[in-house]
């Protein structure tokens, strides 16, 4: 969008005429105070669109924000709307008029607000005062918006001097709401009942002097009337309440209950409705899926959550390996079941700083006299991998071996990588699984063991190198779903004396590094 002249602020003369143009790649429109303005729209041959806004016989009341926006502005980005602010200095207009929404500023929390007193001339000095107060308040002023700051519950006015006369704005009332109220509200003791139980509904009207209540309900449609009771809640500000009580509900009492309130003096009315469900018997229903296999990470806390619907309120029990769980005194396990709505519950099992022994088969059971449901899952404790050992040896056979041992859960994946030219090895080795090697220069043996007691896997991998003719940096990387760990060792040729091995410096670890490739290694996996 392009506005001509571009603004973002223009100062125009009173009684003058001024032309604004906006162009864009789609139909554009000029708006002020969310209203489209009379304008001339056109489409050029190059498929650009424009709109010309002619402001005639300008007065101070033309001061304000003007927007150019695409005609169909749904879902547009903020930068697809251009703002222009026009001042028309007019000594006959003091402060621009405000509507009631701007004069009464309601807050629900302590927050910055704007007292929107605006003038037509950006050169005017404007001050803010408490209503009927002389002292100017130290609050920043923006000629396009007003005074912005955090204000107390008071009334305020703005003052300016136009020529030789002092002009006051309307008073602005800042009020912090303690509570928001509505005229009519309907609620039920419970919206789900079993047949034979009672239905009790309350309709409350606030702030009306003389009211008539009328209830509409399923039983009424079949001609069976119930007499509501009206009373006054004297502890509250002018609340009148109508109670509809249906004893021993039947299935046919399910449906919409509407309370219509008429204020008889001025014939105002309002109504609210609520749905009541009468069920034959209670129920418990699981909501959403919980996978049969759940994971937790060792030493981290884990919350397992089950959401279900039930009526009447159920008893909830948790089991591990068929043993009932309870909140542990040591704070290792926390159980909670919350009622998140009338019939919806969330039951949570929280394992604090998970231990290996907490792996196992878990079951949640929710039940009452009419129904029950249970949900089970296996909990696996994931343990981040650790490389426990990386060692290099020179067997008599002439080959050199590197042995890497590590543990983790789930089963760790092992990656060997190597680098020949130590001087140019990059620090980071790009990992690549070894394979497809045809030469017999190297061999890889990997054994995996599952330790039942620790509930984790141990991986031992041995790399056999046939010909090492210069120093070689070998890295063993272990990786699983919850982490990775690595160690490096430098393997030197048999021909290099022991001292020389030790003297390989940090600098020597620079240089070209590569993954053990077909020409270096050959590996076999043993399961």
């Amino acid at each position: 969008l392009v506005i001509t002249p571009p603004g973002p602020e223009l100062i125009l003369n009173v009684s003058s005429t001024f032309v604004l143009t906006c162009s864009g790649s789609a139909p554009v429109v000029w708006e002020r105070m969310s209203q489209e303005l009379p304008q001339e729209m056109a489409k050029a041959q190059d498929n650009t669109f424009s709109s010309v806004l002619t402001l005639t016989n300008l007065t101070g009341l033309d001061t304000g924000e003007y927007f150019c926006t695409y005609n169909d502005s749904r879902g547009l980005e903020p930068d697809e709307r251009k703002r222009l602010y026009i001042f028309v200095p007019d000594p006959t207009v003091g402060f621009l008029p405000n509507d009631a929404e701007e004069l009464f500023i309601f807050l629900t929390e302590i927050t910055e607000i704007t007292i929107p007193c605006r003038v037509t001339d950006p050169q005017l000095v404007v001050t803010l005062h408490e209503k009927k107060g002389d002292i100017a308040l130290p609050v920043p002023y923006d000629h396009q918006r007003g005074f912005s700051g955090i204000f107390e519950d008071r009334s305020y006015i703005c003052k300016t001097t136009i020529g030789d006369r002092e002009v006051d704005s309307d008073a602005y009332y800042v009020y912090r709401l303690q509570v928001s109220s509505i005229n009519v509200s309907v609620n039920a003791v419970q919206t789900v009942v079993r047949q034979g139980e009672n239905i009790t509904l309350m309709c409350i009207v606030i702030g009306n002097e003389v009211v008539n209540f009328e209830w509409m309900y399923p039983r009424k449609e079949s001609g069976r009337l119930v007499e509501p009771v009206t009373d006054f809640l004297l502890d509250m500000p002018y609340h009148i309440r109508s109670i509809l009580h249906i004893p021993s509900a039947e299935l046919e009492d399910s449906g919409t209950y509407t309370c219509n309130v008429t204020e008889s003096v001025n014939d105002h009315q309002d109504e609210k409705a609520i749905n009541i469900t009468v069920v034959e018997s209670g129920y418990v229903r699981l909501l959403g899926e919980v996978g049969a296999l759940q994971f937790a990470e060792l030493h981290r806390s884990r919350t397992l959550q089950v959401v279900f619907e039930a009526y009447p309120p159920p008893t909830v029990l948790w089991f591990k390996d068929n043993r009932t769980l309870g909140d542990s005194s040591a704070g290792e396990i926390a159980l909670s079941t919350r009622n998140v709505s009338e019939t919806r519950y969330v039951s949570e099992l929280t394992l604090v700083r998970v231990k290996v022994a907490e792996a196992g088969h878990y079951t949640m059971r929710a039940f009452h006299e009419d129904a029950e449901v249970q949900l089970s899952f296996q909990l696996q404790i994931n343990v981040p991998v650790r490389v426990l050992e990386l060692s290099e040896s020179h067997p008599d056979s002439g080959e050199q071996t590197v042995r890497c041992r590590g543990r983790g859960m789930p089963q760790p994946n092992i990656i060997w990588s190597a680098c020949r030219d130590l001087k140019r090895c990059p620090r980071e080795l790009p990992p690549m699984l070894l394979g497809n090697s045809s030469e017999e220069e190297s061999q890889l043996e990997t054994n995996v063991t599952y330790w039942e007691e620790e509930q984790e896997f141990e991986v031992v991998s041995t790399l056999r190198l046939q010909h090492v003719d210069r120093p070689l940096s070998v890295r063993c990387t272990l990786r699983n779903a919850v982490g990775q760990d690595m160690q490096e060792v430098i393997v030197v040729p048999h021909s290099l004396p022991f001292k020389e091995q030790k003297l390989i410096s940090e600098e020597d670890l620079g240089g070209e590094q590569k993954l053990i490739s077909e020409e270096d290694l050959h590996h076999h996996h043993h399961h």
Epitope: P97, N98, D99, A100, E101, E102, L103, F104, F106, D168, D170, A171, Y173, Y175, L177, S180, S181, I182, N183, V184, I206, G207, N208, E209, F232, L234, D235, M236, P237, Y238, E263, V265, N266, D270
Partner: antibody, heavy 127, light 107 residues
């Protein structure tokens, strides 16, 4: 600067009519509720009627319903009280007052009092 | 309609006195109550709104309290300018009702 000036009072016979006017200045008249309040000389104040900013809501004390009508012309910054079927008990000083009723919060009206009053105009109903 | 009852009807006091005027509503009006001061031949002047909020420009010796049905206007130290008649006024729903007034005169 903020000012309300009533006019149109006078002597009228029972059953007669009068139209009171209230001219507002120094504030954005169209943004406020307005009320009429009356006072029998030597007696207390009695609220008579009020109306919202655009005239879509009007309320009256029971004793004047059907006889007195409140109205306004925002472009003229004026409030009116059309009085028909006047009775002796309508004799009073009639005040025009600015009624601080903010826009509804939720569905509930808050209220900050009547903060600006005119000087009053006397209506005498007598035969 | 809600009735507002003020007491006393007349109160004689001296400059510097603490003056208390009470107002009772026939039913709960929460805190929707205003207090006005009126001097002979003049229009009423708003002192307090919402039971306890002081209108701008009103001296701080005036204070209001109460909620529900019982309300109080207190003048902490009566000044010569305070001899006048005081009215409470309820707002509920759409109607307003004034109390019958309390005249504060010089003892």
């Amino acid at each position: 600067q903020v000012q309300l000036v009533e006019s149109g009072g006078g002597l009228v016979q029972p059953g007669g009519s009068l139209r009171l006017s209230c001219a507002a200045s120094g504030f954005t008249f169209s943004s406020y509720w307005m009320s009429w309040v009356r006072q029998v000389p030597g007696k207390g104040l009695e609220w008579v009627a009020n109306m919202n900013q655009d005239g879509t809501e009007k309320y009256y004390v029971d004793s004047v319903k059907g006889r007195l009508t409140i109205s306004r012309e925002n472009v003229k910054n004026s409030l009116y009280l059309q009085m028909n079927g006047l009775r002796a008990e309508d004799t009073a000083v009639y005040y025009c007052a600015r009624d601080l009723v903010p826009p509804r919060q939720g569905d509930y009206y808050y209220y900050f009092g009547m903060d600006v009053w005119g000087h009053g105009t006397m209506v005498t109903v007598s035969s | 309609a809600i009735q507002m009852t003020q007491s006393p009807s007349t109160l004689s006091a001296s400059v510097g006195d603490i003056v208390t005027i009470t107002c009772r509503a026939s039913q709960s009006i929460s805190d929707w109550l205003a207090w006005y001061q009126q001097k002979p031949g003049k229009a009423p002047k708003l002192l307090i709104f919402k039971a306890s909020s002081l209108e701008s420009g009103v001296p701080s010796r005036f204070s209001g309290s109460g909620s529900g049905t019982d309300f109080t206007l207190t003048i902490s130290s009566l000044q010569p300018d305070d001899f006048a008649t005081y009215y409470c006024q309820q707002y509920n729903s759409y109607s307003r009702t004034f109390g019958q007034g309390t005249k504060v005169d010089i003892k």
